[in-house]
Interface confidence: low
């Protein structure tokens, strides 16, 4: 799925209001420095691609994130604010339902959600350009922010 045409501001608002808190709840009891961020993203569509992959694609050692609260809210936000996203996910959802056995929070899942937090932060705040000694021109700094 190409995330280029999503309403990024609406997705950001959903992240700030609920998804971020659900991620924190999932990670409760885990030190913020316990896992190193190894996954990153360069722009908002890329961030959403990585977020979608880590949230919904089962991985070795962690096959059970899709039914977590943060995942369901992520799916809802993408379905609402990314045109045509829902249609591309029907087959994938069926596959995930078959794969899912029980809800187990493994260390691998905690690490994966830690990576997700980093990706969401990067989505929420795109990187400064490597622009040398210039005026402040960070693209994302001019938009209107949303309250928590």
């Amino acid at each position: 799925y190409d995330f280029t045409n999503c309403d990024f501001e609406k997705i950001k608002a959903a992240y700030l209001s609920t998804i971020s808190k659900d991620l924190i709840t999932y990670m409760s009891g885990t030190k913020s420095t316990e896992f190193n961020n190894t996954v990153s993203c360069s722009n908002r569509p890329h961030c959403l691609t990585e977020i979608q992959s880590l949230t919904f694609n089962p991985t070795a050692g962690c096959a059970s994130l899709a039914k977590e609260m943060f995942a369901m809210k992520t799916k809802a936000a993408l379905a609402i604010w990314c045109p045509g996203y829902s249609e591309t996910q029907i087959n994938a959802t069926q596959a995930m339902k078959k794969a899912r056995k029980s809800k187990v929070t493994t260390n691998k899942c905690l690490e994966q959600v830690s990576q997700l937090q980093g990706l969401w932060r990067r989505f929420n705040r795109p990187l400064l350009k490597q622009q040398g000694s210039s005026d402040y021109k960070d693209d994302d700094d001019k938009h209107h922010h949303h309250h928590h």
Partner: antibody
């Protein structure tokens, strides 16, 4: 616990350069931005510039353009601020300040203890 | 460049009184942050994003405003509240106001 520990006080001659370090701990260094702010004796806070430790992207206050250089050493979780062509009015306390963007509006939530730079002939 | 002007420069009040600190921006900003600074110390974040109190900040503090006009209010001054308060915006660069010193009358 998030901590920013800065290098010690410096005394420099006019025309020289100074490089101040800021060692970060207690969080993932590349996740947040680092600002540099200075305060001359009895004066207001003055923003100098900002750097993204993730990719080295920088932006500077125009007032310091060409004189200030911000860099990072990711492996050491350390940010650096170098100010060149020093003059007496650069005498100030220099702070590094982490900028957390989990908050709306991007606030500076943790500050270093400050490094006093004295420029005197 | 967005210029922030704080007023008054000095506010002389007694403990128990109400303090109202103003910060005006030369052009509209999305949010305002406030920091408290005491002599010989680094600034401490006090209010985030106009109205959100930083961790450990007493409920007698509040922040409000929008556009070009923002206010920090202390409902009843306590001895530990006497300090300098700076406003700061993040819309264009990172600029601070000149500060308001809240001193004991």
């Amino acid at each position: 616990e998030v901590q920013l520990v800065q290098s010690g006080a410096e005394v420099k001659k006019p025309g020289a350069s100074v490089k101040v370090s800021c060692k970060a701990s207690g969080y993932t260094f590349t996740d947040d931005y680092m600002n540099w702010v200075r305060q001359a004796p009895g004066q207001r806070l003055e923003w100098m510039g900002i750097i993204s430790p993730y990719n080295g992207g920088t932006s500077y206050n125009q007032k310091f353009k060409g004189r200030v250089t911000l860099t990072v050493d990711k492996s050491a979780s350390t940010a650096y601020m170098e100010l060149s062509s020093l003059r007496s009015e650069d005498t100030a306390v220099y702070y590094c300040a982490r900028e957390d963007y989990d908050y709306d509006g991007y606030a500076m939530d943790y500050w270093g203890q400050g490094t006093t730079v004295t420029v005197s002939s | 460049e967005i210029v922030l002007t704080q007023s008054p420069a000095t506010l002389s009040l007694s403990p128990g009184e109400r303090a109202t600190l103003s910060c005006r921006a030369s052009s509209s900003v999305s949010y305002m942050h406030w920091y408290q600074q005491k002599p010989g110390q680094a600034p401490r974040p006090w209010i985030y994003a106009t109205s959100n109190l930083a961790s450990g900040v007493p409920a007698r503090f509040s922040g409000s405003g929008s556009g070009t006009s923002y206010t920090l209010t202390i409902s009843r001054l306590e001895p530990e509240d006497f300090a300098v308060y700076y406003c700061q915006q993040s819309d264009s660069g990172r600029e601070f106001g000149g500060g308001t010193k809240v001193e004991i009358k």
